[in-house]
C-alpha cells in the first residue's frame, strides 16, 4: 500500500502519458486522478510502466470501483489484468467477446492462469451457454479448454458450436467427456456425406456406441489404429471380426502391434479363434 501524501505542486496529472513513468509510486497515488485513469485506460499499455507502478494504478481503480470495474475499463486493462486476483474478477460482468479476446491476448502462449479461468467462467455463465464464437475464441487461445470442462459443463455446449472444435482440442478429453460431446457432434454433422462425415466425427468417436461403429464399418472409412485405440472398450467388444476388418480397412494389420493393449486385447479375447485366423495376423484369442 502506498502512503497517502499530497501531490507536489505542478505534478498533478492532466492526462495519462509517458511522463508518468518518472513518477514515484507515492506520486502516482497522489497525483493521478482515478476517474482520469479510468477514462484513459487504453493508453496505459503503451506506456512502459514497471509492474510496481501498475500495482499503484490498480489500487486507484479498486478505490474508484469497489463493486467491480465496468466493462469499458476491463476491456483496456491489458497487462494490468495480470495484477487482478480471481476475487477481483468475480465482481466483473463481462459480456463482450472483444473484451474476452483482449484479456486472453495478454496471457497468450501461457497456461491458463487462475485469473483467466475465473474470467472465462464469468463470461460463459453470463452468456448462459458456450456458443460457437466463444468456443472458437477459447480453443484458439487454449486448445485444451474443452477438455478442462466437466461433463456437466459440456452439456451446455450447443451442437452448432461443435463446428469450431479441432481434433487437437480433444486430445486430453477423457471418455466421460467424449460421451457428452459425441452425440452433439453426430447431430452437428448429420447432413454430411459419408467420407466428409467421418473426417469430422473421427475425433469424437471415443464417445461412440457399438451401433454407430457397426454403421461406420459399412462405409469403407478406413479408421486408423490411433482412433481405434481411443474407442470405448464396451463399444468395441460386441463388434465381429468382419466388422472390425471393414472398419479398419488396410489398417487392420496394425491390430497385431496393439494385441496386448485395450481395447484390442479385450476384443481379441471375445472372438472365436477361427474368426481371428481369417485376418491372417496370428492373433491368439
Amino acid at each position: 500500500e502506498v502512503e497517502k501524501t499530497a501531490c507536489p505542486s505542478g505534478k498533478k496529472a492532466r492526462e495519462i502519458d509517458e511522463s508518468l513513468i518518472f513518477y514515484k509510486k507515492w506520486e502516482l497515488e497522489a497525483c493521478v486522478d482515478a476517474a482520469l485513469l479510468a477514462t484513459q485506460m487504453d493508453r496505459v499499455n503503451a506506456i512502459p510502466f514497471t509492474y510496481e507502478q501498475l500495482d499503484v494504478l490498480k489500487h486507484k481503480l479498486d478505490e474508484l470501483y469497489p463493486q467491480g470495474y465496468p466493462e469499458s475499463v476491463i476491456q483496456h486493462l491489458g497487462y494490468l489484468f495480470l495484477k487482478m486476483s480471481p476475487e477481483d474478477i468475480r465482481k466483473w460482468n463481462v459480456t463482450s467477446l472483444e473484451t474476452l479476446k483482449a484479456l486472453l491476448e495478454v496471457n497468450k502462449g501461457h497456461e491458463m492462469s487462475p485469473q483467466v479461468a475465473t474470467l472465462i467462467d464469468r463470461f460463459v455463465k453470463g452468456r448462459g451457454q458456450l456458443d460457437k464464437d466463444t468456443l472458437d475464441t477459447l480453443t484458439a487461445f487454449y486448445p485444451g479448454y474443452l477438455c478442462s470442462l466437466s461433463p456437466e459443463e459440456l452439456s451446455s455446449v450447443p451442437p452448432s458450436s461443435i463446428w469450431a472444435v479441432r481434433p487437437q482440442d480433444l486430445d486430453t478429453c477423457d471418455p466421460r467427456q467424449l460421451d457428452v460431446l459425441y452425440p452433439k457432434a453426430r447431430l452437428a454433422f448429420q447432413n454430411m456425406n459419408g467420407s466428409e462425415y467421418f473426417v469430422k466425427i473421427q475425433s469424437f468417436l471415443g464417445g461412440a456406441p457399438t451401433e454407430d461403429l457397426k454403421a461406420l464399418s459399412q462405409q469403407n472409412v478406413s479408421m486408423d489404429l490411433a482412433t481405434f485405440m481411443k474407442l470405448r472398450t464396451d463399444a468395441v467388444l460386441p463388434l465381429t471380426v468382419a466388422e472390425v476388418q471393414k472398419l479398419l480397412g488396410p489398417h487392420v494389420e496394425g491390430l497385431k502391434a496393439e494385441e496386448r493393449h485395450r481395447p484390442v486385447r479385450d476384443w481379441i479375447l471375445r472372438q472365436r479363434q477361427d474368426d481371428l485366423d481369417t485376418l491372417g495376423l496370428g492373433l491368439q484369442g
Epitope: 506506456i47 512502459p48 495480470l82 492462469s113
Partner: nanobody, 123 residues
Framework: QVQLVESGGGVVQPGRSLRLSCAAS????????MHWFRQAPGKERELVAT????????YYADSVKGRFTISRDNSKNTLYLQMNSLRAEDTAVYYC????????????????WGQGTLVTVSS
Amino acid sequence: QVQLVESGGGVVQPGRSLRLSCAASGTISTARTMHWFRQAPGKERELVATISTGTNTYYYADSVKGRFTISRDNSKNTLYLQMNSLRAEDTAVYYCAVSYYPNEYDGVPYDYWGQGTLVTVSS
C-alpha cells in the same frame, strides 16, 4: 527466474564518463521494458532511463537528458547506460530493472532487479 548483475560503477571526477552494464541471465530480446534507476544516499529511488522494447522508444529523466544514453545488446543479453558529463548530483547506486511480457517466465507480472552498482562523482 532472471538474474541481473550490474557492473561498471566506480569513482570518477566531474565531467568524466562511465559506462554501466547490466548482464541478464535470461534473454532480454523478449522484455517488455528495461530501466535504469538510481538511489542517492538519503533519497528515494528514481527512474533515470527506460527502453520500451515493443516500440523501441527511449525515455530519459530531465536531469540526465542529453548526457546519458540507454542501449541494449540482445546478442549479449546486456543493458547499458552510457553516462557523460557526470556531476556530483549523479552520485548514487544505479540499478537495472527488466519487466517481461507476462507469458515469459511463468506468466508472472514482475519486475526483475539487479543488486546495484555504486557511482561516485567527486573531485
